[in-house]
């Protein structure tokens, strides 16, 4: 067990041109806060995958109001560290996401509004117990400077926080099979930490986090007796005849979840699903209010003014979950038309359109010819590859200003061969195609046994049916 600690040093405009506008103004004062999300390993995980190592939210920073005409300075930061406790071993390699959030303090209906200012992410190697590591990350025009470290919580030590150290019981040496704890030579290595909840009477471990059962016991936590009973009694051992497995007391027996939480068994022990307003391993921590900022990703917190009343997070588009912690993959609906690339930015969907298309969903086919003149006798049409102009023989380029090979733009469709001719280019069509540019199949794949061709899209160079 241990704690990952993050210290934010500064958040402000990065070097170079294009300084960002201040996020706050005299009309809309605001303050910053930060969220950190940690995941084990170096995998290139999606931003919305769970923060398996943990997450933390900073306090709110001081209120900031922009000075008119002044460039955006480094913004005032919240006090203190962001701390992410981890229960198991520190993985050594981890991925992080640090989000900078703005809380606007204007006169919004329903209280303050939150919006994501910047998100940085990275993958790092880090040994627990080491010194602070410094880092600089840029997100757009913003720059975030921070330090981080992982430290073990006593009695755990080591680069993964898996070794335990306890004060020596005898002044001279450690117990049998236990070594002194470097660098704490006055302490001794303690036995391994088994899986949480592993039965101290019936279970043991040889590796941190495991739970191996003594003979006669089973289950993930060695709490289930293996009995050879007739299986008539619901629990407990019985006469040795039939060799049945009788469940012993399960981890959810007696419901360890407080405050109305529901218990479900897991391979490791149990898990509590807590009602709104409670959290913790056993739903024992209460008193989350809107003042604690429980809604992530710009969710609006309503109710929960006092610890006894539940809060509700109203999530912005693209997020769901009781705390708006889950991102909806809106790109899976393929909202971008005409081959546009979908980008889910969290606060909005963006479509990055292919050349020649525009609009929020790339739904508009641009009129490339509007206000465009073609030189050297060219005529403006959309077509023939990337050219906006259909150029006269011997000219090419976007505006027909360059002397060029008229066949370079592949002007003949469906595998037609292009020839430069004194009167212009000539397409020699492949068998079965006709038209000045071979764009018309004479009999489109036309077996008479085919049903009337279905509507819609057919890749056409060469033409084929899907």
């Amino acid at each position: 067990a241990g704690v990952f600690e993050l210290q934010i040093h500064s958040f402000g405009p990065g070097p170079g041109p294009g300084a960002p506008r201040s996020p706050c103004s005299a009309r809309l004062p605001c303050r910053l806060f930060f969220r950190v999300c940690l995941k084990p390993g170096l995998s290139e995980e999606a931003a919305e995958s769970p923060c398996a190592l943990g997450a933390a939210l900073s306090a709110r920073g001081p209120v900031y109001t922009e000075q008119p005409g002044a460039p955006a300075p480094d913004l005032p930061l919240p006090d203190g560290l962001l701390q992410v406790p981890f229960r198991d071993a520190w993985p050594g390699t981890f991925s992080f996401i640090i989000e900078t959030w703005r809380e606007e303090l204007g006169d919004q209906i329903g209280g303050p509004a939150w919006s994501l200012l910047a998100r940085v992410a990275g993958r790092r190697r880090l040994a627990a117990g080491g010194p602070w590591a410094r880092d600089i990350q840029r997100a757009g025009a913003w720059e975030l400077r921070f330090s981080y470290r992982a430290r073990c919580e006593p009695p755990a030590v080591g680069t993964a926080c898996t070794r335990l150290c306890r004060p020596r019981s005898a002044p001279s040496r450690c117990g049998p099979g236990l070594r002194p704890c470097a660098p704490l030579e006055d302490e001794c290595e303690a036995p391994l930490v088994c899986r949480a909840g592993c039965s101290p009477e019936h279970g043991f471990c040889e590796q941190p986090g495991e739970c191996r059962c003594l003979e006669g016991w089973t289950g993930p936590l060695c709490t289930v007796p293996v009995s050879t009973s007739s299986c008539l009694s619901p629990r407990g051992p019985s006469s040795a005849t039939t060799g049945c497995l009788v469940p012993g007391p399960g981890p959810c027996d007696g419901n360890p979840c407080a405050n109305g939480g529901s218990c479900s068994e897991t391979p490791r022990s149990f898990e509590c699903t807590c009602p709104r307003g409670f959290y913790g391993l056993r739903c024992e921590v209460s008193g989350v209010t809107c003042a604690d900022g429980p809604c992530f990703n710009g969710g609006l917190c309503v109710g929960g003014a006092d610890p006894d009343s539940a809060y509700i997070c109203h999530c912005p588009p693209g997020f769901q979950g009781s705390n708006c912690e889950k991102r909806v993959d809106r790109c899976s609906l393929q909202p971008c038309r005409n081959g546009g690339l979908c980008l889910d930015l969290g606060h909005a969907l963006r479509c990055r359109c292919r050349a020649g298309f525009a609009g929020p969903r790339c739904e508009h086919d641009l009129d490339d010819c509007a206000g465009r003149a073609c030189a050297n006798g060219g005529t403006c049409v959309e077509g023939g590859g990337a050219h906006r102009c259909s150029c006269a023989l011997g000219f090419g380029g976007r505006d027909c200003r360059e002397r060029a090979d008229p066949c370079a733009a592949r002007p003949c469709a469906h595998g037609g061969r292009c020839y430069a001719h004194f009167s212009g280019l000539v397409c020699a069509c492949a068998p079965g195609y006709m038209g000045a540019r071979c764009e018309f199949p004479v009999h489109p794949d036309g077996a008479s046994a085919l049903p009337a061709a279905p509507p819609g899209l057919r890749p056409g160079d060469p033409q084929r049916y899907l």
Partner: nanobody
Framework: EVQLVESGGGLVQPGGSLTLSCAAS????????MAWYRQAPGKKRELVAG???????IYIDSVKGRFTISRDNAKNSVYLQMNSLRAEDTAVYYC???????????WGQGTLVTVSS
């Protein structure tokens, strides 16, 4: 993606006239080479008439002088004016588009033309 919707088909007597319309969406017809095809029962689909992106037209021999293909950029539509219709013109007529930028082809659903007395 380009969508094509044909209309104007129906029953007509030999020697009569019909005009087929093909309304395009998703791209301007000025940017497309468009054509009309037809498929009679038990036969291959065949090209009838085409109009290139630059406005040049093409017809198969059996309809030359009787059919005219045209384009209306403002209405984003292509038309096939069919005069002096014959029984052998009976078929399902399909609108076709070739998009130069993507080099993809598109088809409409088809409209039935029946020439019968």
């Amino acid at each position: 993606e380009v969508q094509l919707v044909e209309s104007g088909g129906g029953l007509v007597q030999p020697g009569g006239s019909l005009t087929l319309s093909c309304a395009a969406s998703g791209s301007s017809v000025r940017f497309l080479s468009m054509a009309w095809y037809r498929q009679a029962p038990g036969k291959k689909r065949e090209l009838v008439a085409g109009i290139s992106a630059d406005g040049s037209t093409i017809y198969i021999d059996s309809v030359k002088g009787r059919f005219t293909i045209s384009r209306d950029n403002a209405k984003n539509s292509v038309y096939l004016q069919m005069n002096s219709l014959r029984a052998e013109d009976t078929a399902v007529y399909y609108c076709y588009a070739y998009r130069w930028r993507t080099r993809y082809t598109y088809w409409g659903q088809g409209t039935l033309v029946t020439v019968s007395s």
